[in-house]
Interface confidence: medium
């Protein structure tokens, strides 16, 4: 009995009501493995989800997020609202990055600016809400005789710029 069912390929199910014959998956369902007694319900890309790949009898649908949202989780299991660069998503919506932090993407959290002095370097370009600071050569690299393509910026830690 089981041997008959194991012959049923992906895209079919082993139909107990019809003497173990292989029946095609019902509409809007799929079986990605052989030998199944039932097919799986196709994923429906509704609401904030949009269809990236249609369901077939052997593979599930794949979803993306509509404009203004981005995927989270395995196989885009959730859609999260986009924010602007220089913002992060909180429970109350998109909020500007606090001073001393930045976010250069439409998703994720604001991260602290790099502390150039930890590496013995100086700030070459100040940080903003959207961009990290750019660290320049260390003061030692700028001593007479050292070659430097760029002049040092005013050393303001931790990278202050008016917001």
């Amino acid at each position: 009995l089981q041997d008959l069912c194991s012959n049923c390929p992906a895209g079919t199910f082993c139909d107990n009501n019809r003497s173990q014959i292989c029946s095609p998956c019902p509409p809007n369902s799929f079986s990605s493995a052989g030998g199944q007694r039932t097919c799986d319900i196709c994923r429906q890309c509704k609401g904030v989800f949009k269809t990236r790949k249609e369901c077939s009898s052997t593979s599930n649908a794949e979803c993306d997020c509509i404009s203004g949202y981005h995927c989270l989780g395995a196989e885009c299991s959730m859609c999260e609202q986009d924010c602007k660069q220089g913002q992060e998503l909180t429970k109350k919506g998109c909020k500007d990055c606090c001073f001393g932090t930045f976010n250069d993407q439409k998703r994720g959290i604001c991260r602290p600016w790099t502390n150039c002095s930890l590496d013995g370097k100086s700030v070459l370009v100040n940080g903003t809400k959207e961009r990290d600071v750019v660290c320049g050569p260390s003061p030692a690299d700028l001593s007479p005789g050292a070659s430097s393509a760029t002049p040092p910026a005013p050393a303001r830690e931790p990278g202050h710029s008016p917001q």
């Epitope: 009501n17 809007n28 493995a33 007694r37 039932t38 799986d40």
Partner: antibody, heavy 118, light 111 residues
Framework: QVQLQQSGAELARPGASVKMSCKAS????????MHWVKQRPGQGLEWIGY????????IYNQKFKDKATLTADKSSSTAYMQLSSLTSEDSAVYYC???????????WGAGTTVTVSS | DIVLTQSPASLAVSLGQRATISCRAS??????????MNWFQQKPGQPPKLLIY???NQGSGVPARFSGSGSGTDFSLNIHPMEEDDTAMYFC?????????FGGGTKLEIK
């Protein structure tokens, strides 16, 4: 013969979680999807969702997406449903049901009664 | 969601007579010529029992006096002749579209 044996009644406090089981016997567990259905006292039936024990693929009724978590253990032929953040609205009988090929529930467990009370 | 409306909510039928229960769907539950409509019987303290699947196919071991018909949005369950053992709640259920939904139920009693 084909049977679905569900775990015993649960009494829980509001805010707590419960995990109930549904042990399958008499058939090959991994070849059928397992669905879960809720029935409140004297009321109708509500479909919660299902799990394919082979692929661990799940689909939930959006209404229960943050309430129920479905899992399956192939080695013991057992499906599980965990209900979280319980409220009085979750007091009900919960059934597991095997899905036949043409998308009907052909075998049902006897049900697990969950009572939420402080 | 597809809403299933059953009528009547309760019904009393004499032994040997015909009982007819209707189920109307808020949209078609047909797909590629298949009606994804099932019927269940439930007695107090018991789980539901499959009677009819795909609108008109009898479940395993279901007596011939139970029959189902319909397509699209309108379906019916017929019980003839009515027997004492048929006193129960009856539910329709669609499996065309997630979330799968059930009708509100019809209570069938003996007159």
């Amino acid at each position: 013969q084909v049977q679905l044996q569900q775990s015993g009644a649960e009494l829980a406090r509001p805010g707590a979680s419960v995990k109930m089981s549904c042990k399958a016997s008499g058939y090959i567990f991994t070849t059928y999807a397992m669905h879960w259905v809720k029935q409140r006292p004297g009321q109708g039936l509500e479909w919660i969702g299902y799990i394919n024990p082979t692929t661990v693929y799940t689909i939930y009724n959006q209404k229960f997406k943050d309430k129920a978590t479905l899992t399956a253990d192939k080695s013991s032929s057992t499906a599980y449903m965990q209900l979280s953040s319980l409220t009085s609205e979750d007091s009900a009988v919960y059934y597991c049901a095997r899905l036949g090929g043409h998308w009907y529930f052909d075998v049902w467990g006897a049900g697990t009664t969950v009572t939420v009370s402080s | 969601d597809i809403v299933l409306t059953q009528s009547p909510a309760s019904l009393a039928v004499s032994l040997g007579q015909r009982a007819t229960i209707s189920c109307r769907a808020s949209e078609s539950v047909d797909n590629y010529g298949i009606s994804f409509m099932n019927w269940f019987q439930q007695k107090p303290g018991q789980p539901p029992k499959l009677l009819i699947y795909s609108a008109s196919n009898q479940g395993s071991g279901v007596p011939a006096r139970f029959s189902g018909s319909g397509s699209g949005t309108d379906f019916s369950l017929n019980i003839h002749p009515m027997e004492e053992d048929d006193t129960a709640m009856y539910f329709c259920q669609q499996s065309k579209e997630v979330p799968w939904t059930f009708g509100g139920g019809t209570k069938l009693e003996i007159k």
